[in-house]
Interface confidence: medium
């Protein structure tokens, strides 16, 4: 079968699931596109303990997650369900704000320097997390 | 040892498709993305397209997008590249190659089968 | 979509001599570059991946170097079975271009 039991080299491995954090940046649709080639997803934060996971690792900086509303309502890339889910955004976010004179409101969420979200303008080049779930992640490290 | 094989020559009429097969061995088939790689007569490389046989995700270049269609049977370890509405200016060596991962998202092609040769001719 | 331009199209050096091709991107690619040696009616070979680092099995007279925008591969000392066409290629997302090549010739 396909199933995998570890992660690939680089990633790291927490509940069942794999997690590559970016050292650079990226738009929000390239950092999307980047995991996507990956074979995986912008990570997508379903507890409090995935997210103290994530902050744990990123640190105080800017890092978009899979989450945006670039439809209408926010909608978590892999499909999990936004409304019913876990949610930790800043206080009086997200506010969909236009006056940072870019064009627009804001679509894509990110961490901020405190862990907590917030929407942005999809085109800032931020930090990003990939995710993919550790049945479907590589066992063994690349051959050359 | 890691062997991408491909299937042999084909020469195609305008307006026909193609379907050419790269048999992988010597790796677990569904850890690695397979990509597809043209080169015609005398000219240089032009990515094609990708595909994933874990999930069976797949990403095409722009040119491609609609006329390409890349799959991949996990039985058999085979990833298959079909081509239609061929035109003569699809006569090309096509490759398929496997896509590689070192530190993170840095990634190559570390692989290649043969070259498949398809002519294109009416 | 991301522009390569790769220099000098085409090169011809002695035995011994010292080789640099460039890679030039139209936007910041870290180090995500590749660069492979293809000789005729075959199919290309990986030698640099992640901009500076040597696949198995090259010999150490290669090296890559560079990283953002400009990016280079040296062969410090030309021996007569690197002849051939060289292309860098990126992966900073889809689509994976090409350099438009460089055809090395042994004078």
């Known amino acids: 079968g396909s199933e995998r039991t570890c992660c690939p080299v680089n990633w790291v491995e927490h509940e069942r699931s794999c997690y590559w954090f970016s050292r650079s940046g990226k738009a929000w649709a390239d950092a999307d596109n980047y995991c996507r080639l990956e074979d995986a997803h912008l990570v997508v934060v379903t507890s409090w303990e995935e997210q103290k996971f994530v902050q744990h690792h990123i640190g105080p900086v800017n890092t978009w997650m899979g989450l945006h509303d670039q439809n209408g309502p926010w909608k978590w890339v892999d499909g999990t369900d936004y409304e019913t889910g876990f949610k930790n955004w800043r206080p009086e976010q997200p506010d969909d704000w236009y006056g940072h004179g870019l064009g627009g409101g804001e679509d894509c969420a990110h961490f901020t320097d405190d862990g907590r979200w917030n929407d942005d303008v999809c085109q800032r080049p931020y930090r990003w997390v990939c995710e993919t779930e550790l049945d479907k992640a590589s066992q063994e490290p690349p051959l050359l | 040892e890691v062997q991408l094989v491909q299937s042999g020559a084909e020469v195609k009429k305008p307006g026909s498709s193609v379907k050419v097969s790269c048999k992988a061995s010597?790796?677990?088939?569904?850890?690695?993305?397979i990509n597809w790689v043209r080169q015609a007569p005398g000219q240089g490389l032009e990515w094609i397209g990708e595909?994933?046989?874990?999930?069976?995700?797949?990403f095409y270049a722009q040119k491609f997008q609609g006329r390409a269609t890349l799959t991949a049977d996990k039985s058999t370890s085979t990833a298959y590249m079909e081509l239609s509405s061929l035109r003569s200016e699809d006569t090309a060596v096509y490759y398929c190659?496997?896509?590689?991962?070192?530190?993170?998202?840095?990634?190559?092609?570390?692989?290649w089968g043969q070259g498949t040769t398809l002519t294109v001719s009416s | 979509d991301i522009q390569m331009t790769q220099s000098p199209s085409s090169l011809s050096a002695s035995v011994g001599d010292r080789v640099t091709i460039t890679c030039r991107i139209s936007?910041?690619?870290?180090?995500?570059l590749a660069w492979y040696q293809q000789k005729p009616g075959k199919a290309p070979k990986l030698l640099v991946y992640?901009?500076?680092n040597l696949a198995d099995g090259v010999p150490s007279r290669f090296s890559g170097s560079g990283s953002g925008t400009d990016f280079t591969l040296t062969i410090s000392s030309l021996q007569p079975e690197d002849f051939g066409t060289y292309y860098c290629?990126?992966?900073?997302?889809?689509?994976?271009?090409f350099g438009q090549g460089t055809k090395l010739e042994i004078k």
């Open positions: 992640a901009a500076i």
């Open positions: 010597g790796y677990t088939f569904t850890n690695y993305g």
């Open positions: 595909i994933f046989p874990r999930s069976d995700n797949t």
């Open positions: 936007e910041n690619i870290y180090s995500n």
């Open positions: 190659a496997r896509k590689g991962r070192d530190y993170g998202t840095s990634h190559y092609f570390d692989y």
């Open positions: 290629q990126h992966f900073w997302g889809t689509p994976f271009t």
